[in-house]
């Protein structure tokens, strides 16, 4: 083992932006940071055969298999895949290491298999074996974490039944509101499954794996906080565990906490209490109400009472199936070109939704914010004043929801013209949709005031570009106007725009644009 490591094998994952078959390359594209594949000498192999850790790749992902050799000078190499030789161009990095790369763009089943790399340097020969397979993500799951009490201990265990095994972390915050945002300095993260410090203001548990990250907040009633104007509501599905924490701080230990469901004390075994002294010698008590697997009859008002604080309640609603409640009627908006505006959807949902905003076949990330009344809101402001159709889509394990929005931007028309041997057409995308006039320019009417009404055909909104309407007007050519200049004008409440067209023989037409506000 004293001759290790002379070579380093790495996997580089790329952000997809191209498609091709595997190709040998010395300069891969922009990428994520390299992952060490720990090339180890293959036991019981004749010669110097190194084996990289197996590589699992998502379908359509782009990767680079890379080998770094600490052998400057002349090196030659050859890739072999499925009995075919692939060309190989080594280069040297700043540190004089030989670099050999194999880029696999848009991974497919045909590109999975064993990649053999033969390297010949002045000093030694190396054979490196990479095994690349397609990751079976169909079997992957990421479930929202839930809480369990640790046996014989005052501690909570966070569980997420996910594949692959997720990394579980507790996210703790002792501040209020905005300062408990994920990246705030007030937030402390603990990458462990068991939590003993249960007195904090805000406690969440998150689980993450290749599919993403899911979090569950420990539902808390704080008797020292002013109650919300609307009763806090907690939704659960039948069979899920219920956890509610009641927290109270008092100048001394002379107070107690109790839980009631619909005015009946909770049964023993459905609650446990913890207490501690805070830094200023006040007493903090917390009382957990929990049901390991809820049924419909666990629905109701859970009230936490204290001998020294006003009691507070939460409504627990047990549902058979998840839901998304929101109005799905489409909404149309009309705004000025520089007006600040955001689309917003207010909804109530359980379990928490995953959502996207879509415009012009492009998806945008979707943020949700919880409101005090149990509703959540998602806003989209990144429309860059582009008119058209915007779609909000939300889903959870049990429900789906889609809502359509149309955005119209008030602006004066812009006219485009085209002509053929038999007709001239003008198009405009202004809003409100413009009206059209055609005028003939002649010796009698050098200012083009002679209106043309014959042979004009207006089509309102004949072409819908991602919800953006385009209006057009067509003038059929007649002997009376052939050889003349004609002017088409589009006008709406914000202004007028015109194009002048010379109606002669077919071919490229000269267009003169007039802008009249």
């Amino acid at each position: 083992n004293q001759d290790l490591p002379v070579i380093k094998c790495v996997l580089i994952n790329h952000k997809n932006n191209d498609s091709s078959v595997g190709k040998s390359s010395s300069y891969p594209m922009v990428s994520e940071s390299p992952e060490d594949l720990g090339c180890a000498l293959r036991p019981q192999s004749s010669g110097t055969v190194y084996e990289a850790a197996a590589v699992e790749v998502d379908v359509s992902a782009s990767i680079t298999l890379q080998v770094l050799v600490d052998a400057p000078g002349n090196i030659s190499c050859l890739w072999v895949f499925k009995h075919s030789s692939l060309n190989c161009q080594p280069h040297f990095d700043l540190q004089n290491r030989g670099v050999v790369s194999m880029v696999i763009l848009k991974m497919t089943e045909t590109q999975a298999g064993e990649y053999l790399l033969f390297i010949q340097s002045e000093a030694t020969n190396y054979t490196i074996l990479f095994t690349v397979s397609i990751r079976n993500t169909l079997l992957y799951t990421l479930r929202r974490p839930y809480f369990r009490k640790m046996e014989n201990q005052d501690a909570l265990v966070c569980i997420s039944e996910s594949v692959p095994e997720p990394i579980v972390e507790w996210v703790l915050c002792d501040s209020q509101g905005e300062s408990c945002k994920e990246e705030s300095p007030a937030v402390v993260k603990k990458e462990e499954k068991v939590l003993h410090e249960l007195f904090g203001t805000d406690i969440r548990c998150c689980a993450r794996n290749e599919l993403g990250r899911e979090c569950t907040r420990l539902f808390t009633i704080d008797l020292n906080q002013t109650p919300q104007t609307t009763l806090p509501q907690l939704f659960l599905k039948v069979g899920e565990p219920l956890w509610i924490r009641c927290k109270a701080v008092h100048v001394n230990h002379g107070f107690g906490l109790t839980w009631e469901l619909e005015n009946k004390a909770l049964e023993e075994g459905n609650y446990f209490e913890m207490s501690t002294y805070s830094t200023n010698r006040t007493m903090i008590r917390i009382l957990f109400a929990f049901v390991s697997s809820v049924a419909r009859n666990d629905t109701g008002y859970y009230t936490c009472s204290s001998s020294k604080h006003p009691s507070q309640s939460a409504l627990v609603t047990i549902v058979e199936k998840g839901f998304i409640n929101a109005t799905n009627s489409s909404e149309d908006y009309e705004i000025d070109q520089y007006e600040e505006f955001c689309f917003s959807v207010r909804f109530k949902a359980y379990p928490q939704i995953r959502c996207t905003w879509t415009f012009s076949r492009k998806s945008f990330p979707c943020e949700q914010k919880g409101l005090d009344n149990g509703y959540s809101i998602s806003k989209f402001c990144n429309h860059k004043h582009q008119p058209g159709e915007y779609i909000f889509h939300a889903e959870n394990d049990d429900a789906q929801f889609t809502k359509m929005f149309t955005l119209n931007i008030r602006r004066k028309p812009q006219v485009l013209a085209e002509a053929s041997a038999s007709q001239a057409s003008c198009f405009s995308d202004g809003y409100p949709l413009p009206s059209w006039t055609w005028k003939k320019c002649s010796d009698k009417s050098p200012n083009c005031t002679e209106e043309i009404t014959e042979g004009v055909w207006n089509r309102k909104a004949n072409r819908k570009v991602f919800g953006q309407w385009v209006s057009s007007s067509t003038l059929n050519m007649s002997e009376a106007i052939k050889g003349f200049l004609v002017k088409c004008c589009a006008y709406n409440s914000l202004g007028t725009s015109c194009e002048t067209i010379l109606l002669n023989s077919p071919g490229p037409f000269p267009f003169i644009q007039d802008n009249i506000s």
Epitope: V6, A71, P72, T124
Partner: antibody, heavy 118, light 106 residues
Amino acid sequence: EVQLQESGAELVKPGASVKLSCKASGYTFTNYWINWLKQRPGQGLEWIGNIYPGSTIINYNEKFKNKATLTVDTSSSTAYMQLSSLTSDDSAVYYCARRVVYLYFDSWGQGTTLTVSS
Amino acid sequence: QIVLTQSPAIMSASPGEKVTMTCSASSSVSYMHWYQQKSGTSPKRWIFDTSKLASGVPVRFSGSGSGTSYSLTITNMETEDAATYYCQQWSSKSPTFGGGTKLEIK
């Protein structure tokens, strides 16, 4: 076991030259870069340069280009560093170290103390 | 040349205490390596590729960071951990070292 054995302490006069040695054992000498580093008392480490015994490719830190000369003798698996035109600024502990492909130094010599004094 | 700045230059900790020292690079580097050096001895490789422990290094040591900011942490300081720790990068043509953090026992 990988070992780098450096030559003993040197006391030399200003203006003179000195040749330090580093004998490698326990691995294939021609497969790894030998690096030389300088450490003044109570100070950090400075990289002087490196040499690849397999093809005698040499790199120098710009600062030491006119100060150090690196050579190897593959038959005895020994690397050498000659320091010329010595001044009191060259008084330091000099280490040879083996570089691995991960770009760190995995094995170090015990160091040679060089004192330049009249 | 990439300059590495280690802080603090000197620190002391009691046994059992958590210790964190940092290494800041003047421009972004791919990996950071760490060495431990005790008085009168040569440096020992300690952490490589930012977070991998060299063989024989106790698991109470850990390394992390990216870009221009890296750190070495000891979860439970022990007396044998008293030493000077150097960070090192080789993302540029020449490798450079930080000035070292001297960790003393309280």
